[in-house]
């Protein structure tokens, strides 16, 4: 008598999540009489997946009619596959009895589930950093299988190299996650720059997923301050200009102080954008020289994006050199910088 064979022809089957998986099993003989059962795993911890004879298995159907006379095909179809369905499936022949007796197991079919990675989510630093500093961006994607995946970072189309990437877990799992950190050196020209995290996986058919982050969310470009005096007017008023240039973001407060006392405070709003995404702003202060007996110390104080204030100070001499006019500029943009402006009555 020929020995009964339980044949599972495929050693492995790979299915996309959401699809159906067909697990094939045939037997070489109709005898002895008894049922076929499908298990995931082997040994005492195995799970019953399908019993052709009895039970309720809503996602599992027999490919052939098991009640058909002389049926030797015991293949099953599992619908709506998820990564949790991965594992080795065994087709097992039992001999009819009370209870049924296990006779022979097929060699097993390893079911692997291909699952797409989630859309990459890119997050930047919690606080802004200034140009010439390095900031970290993180990209995360989850739920993919198999484990092999490629992640690349780009800044304005150029691939970044200072990258650290981890795929978890390290061992075999139903699905995996990827987390990558890219370090980006900021420049003053990066307000309009963008970083892109690009994820390629077998399930994406060559069409990678992308997550983006704008460097405008991460960068602070501190302003340059320039103070100039316009020509003295006939009515003994000196027009002093504070030019605040090339700053980002727009959040900026400018305060004029005369001899340490607040003269006027202005908030930047609705400024036109420069080509590089930064902003400029100019503020004027008219100083009535004839109203002052002593020198006037003028300070242009700029507070940008919650950072410590930057000051530019000027001394307006009210008595000497009545006719001297000209322009004085403070080019540095930190600390205190004093200049003398001479004015007087003619």
């Amino acid at each position: 008598e020929e020995e009964l064979q339980v044949i599972q022809p495929e050693k492995s089957v790979s299915v996309a999540a959401g699809d159906s998986a067909t697990l094939n099993c045939t037997v070489s003989s109709l005898i002895p009489v008894g049922p076929i059962q499908w298990f995931r795993g082997a040994g005492p911890g195995r799970e019953l997946i399908y019993n052709l004879k009895e039970g309720h298995f809503p996602r599992v159907t027999a490919v052939s009619d098991p009640t058909k006379r002389n049926n030797m095909d015991f293949s099953i179809r599992i619908s709506n596959i998820t990564p949790a369905d991965a594992g080795t499936y065994y087709c097992v022949k039992f001999r009819k009895g009370s209870p049924d007796v296990e006779l022979k197991s097929g060699a097993g079919t390893e079911l692997s589930v291909r699952a797409k990675p989630s859309a990459p989510v890119v997050s930047g630093p919690a606080v802004r950093a200034t140009a010439e500093h390095t900031v970290s961006f993180t990209c995360e994607s989850h739920g993919f299988s198999p484990r092999d995946i490629t992640l690349k970072w780009f800044k304005n189309g150029n691939e970044l190299s200072d990258v650290q990437t981890n795929v978890d877990p390290a061992g075999k799992s139903v699905s995996y996650s990827i987390r990558s950190t890219a370090r980006v050196l900021l420049t003053r020209r990066d307000v309009h720059s963008q970083v892109i995290c690009e994820v390629a996986h077998v399930t994406l058919q060559g069409d990678p997923l992308r997550g983006t982050a704008n460097l405008s969310e991460a960068i602070r470009v501190p302003p340059f301050l320039e103070v100039t005096q316009q020509s003295m007017r006939a009515d003994n008023q000196v027009n002093v200009t504070c030019q605040v240039t090339k700053f980002y973001p727009q959040r900026l407060q400018l305060t004029w102080l005369e001899n340490g006392n607040v003269s006027r405070t202005e908030m930047a709003s609705a400024l036109p954008e420069n080509k590089d995404g930064t902003y400029n702003w100019t503020s004027w202060l008219l100083v009535n020289v004839s109203a002052h007996r002593d020198d006037v110390k003028l300070t242009c104080q700029v507070e940008h994006d919650g950072q410590p204030a930057v000051n530019k100070s000027f001394s307006v001499k009210v008595s000497a050199h009545p006719k001297e006019q000209g322009s004085n500029t403070a080019a540095e943009n930190t600390g205190t910088n004093e200049r003398n402006i001479y004015g007087g009555s003619g």
């Epitope: 795993g41 040994g43 005492p44 911890g45 799970e47 991965a86 001999r95 007796v101 296990e102």
Partner: antibody
Framework: QVQLQESGPGLVRPSETLSLTCTVS????????WSWIRQPPGKGLEWIGF???????FYNPSLKSRVTISLDMSINQFSLKMTSVTAADTAVYYC????????????????WGQGTTVTVSS | DIVMTQSPLSLPVTPGEPASISCKSS???????????LDWYLQRPGQSPQLLIY???NRASGVPDRFSGSGSGTDFTLKISRVEAEDVGVFYC?????????FGGGTKVEIK
């Protein structure tokens, strides 16, 4: 190839809880049983229990009330906790991998850790 | 629980000579699928046990062919066709049919 490494305290006080971890490297946790076995000084081997990759656990009835085995596939580790230890629990504790691919039985404990000595003493 | 009994307790051997160890189980280890769920292990001095034989007669990967397993039901035998010096240690049988897994008491093989 697959390697197993036990870790945990070498000395445990009587009545306290023994906690050991086994780290699996170079292979998959999937499709295997992960076992704890102990060997008292100068004696034979005693099976404590094992956990299947699907989370199902099996324990030696003589120890069941005191033993918990857990598995963390995300970090390729499985653990043993044994409560209310006494001097009789002094032993070398091995973690091991058990194969299964032929029905209800098991097909050999084919990978073993090097063992960690646990002494129960005050 | 299935009780495993090994004999002899100690086995002095001569290198190059054959050796044989017996293992008996308190109930049959032959499952209805035709497999006998019995393993043999060797624990060399100061080392962890090593799988030699599974399912009664299948040699594990990397195990020399001088080791062979036989038997069915309740009586099993491990044979070493020609003992080598590296074979010294304690040999254990273990039933793997049902939990709790149980070991024999061990057979200590030493060179005469």
């Amino acid at each position: 190839q697959v390697q197993l490494q036990e870790s945990g305290p070498g000395l445990v006080r009587p009545s306290e809880t023994l906690s050991l971890t086994c780290t699996v490297s170079g292979g998959s946790i999937r499709n295997y049983y992960w076992s704890w076995i102990r060997q008292p000084p100068g004696k034979g081997l005693e099976w404590i229990g094992f956990i299947y990759y699907n989370g199902r656990t099996f324990y030696n009835p003589s120890l069941k009330s005191r033993v918990t085995i857990s598995l963390d596939m995300s970090i390729n580790q499985f653990s043993l906790k044994m409560t209310s230890v006494t001097a009789a629990d002094t032993a070398v504790y091995y973690c091991a991998r058990v194969r299964a691919y032929s029905g209800i039985g098991l097909d050999g404990t084919d990978v073993w850790g090097q063992g960690t000595t646990v002494t129960v003493s005050s | 629980d299935i009780v495993m009994t090994q004999s002899p307790l100690s086995l002095p051997v001569t290198p190059g000579e054959p050796a044989s160890i017996s293992c008996k189980s308190s109930q049959s280890l032959l499952y209805s699928n035709g497999y006998a769920y019995l393993d043999w292990y060797l624990q060399r001095p100061g080392q962890s046990p090593q799988l030699l034989i599974y399912q009664g007669s299948n040699r594990a990967s990397g195990v020399p062919d001088r080791f062979s397993g036989s038997g069915s039901g309740t009586d099993f035998t491990l044979k070493i066709s020609r003992v080598e010096a590296e074979d010294v240690g304690v040999f254990y049988c273990m039933q793997a049919l049902q939990t709790p897994l149980t070991f024999g008491g061990g057979t200590k093989v030493e060179i005469k």
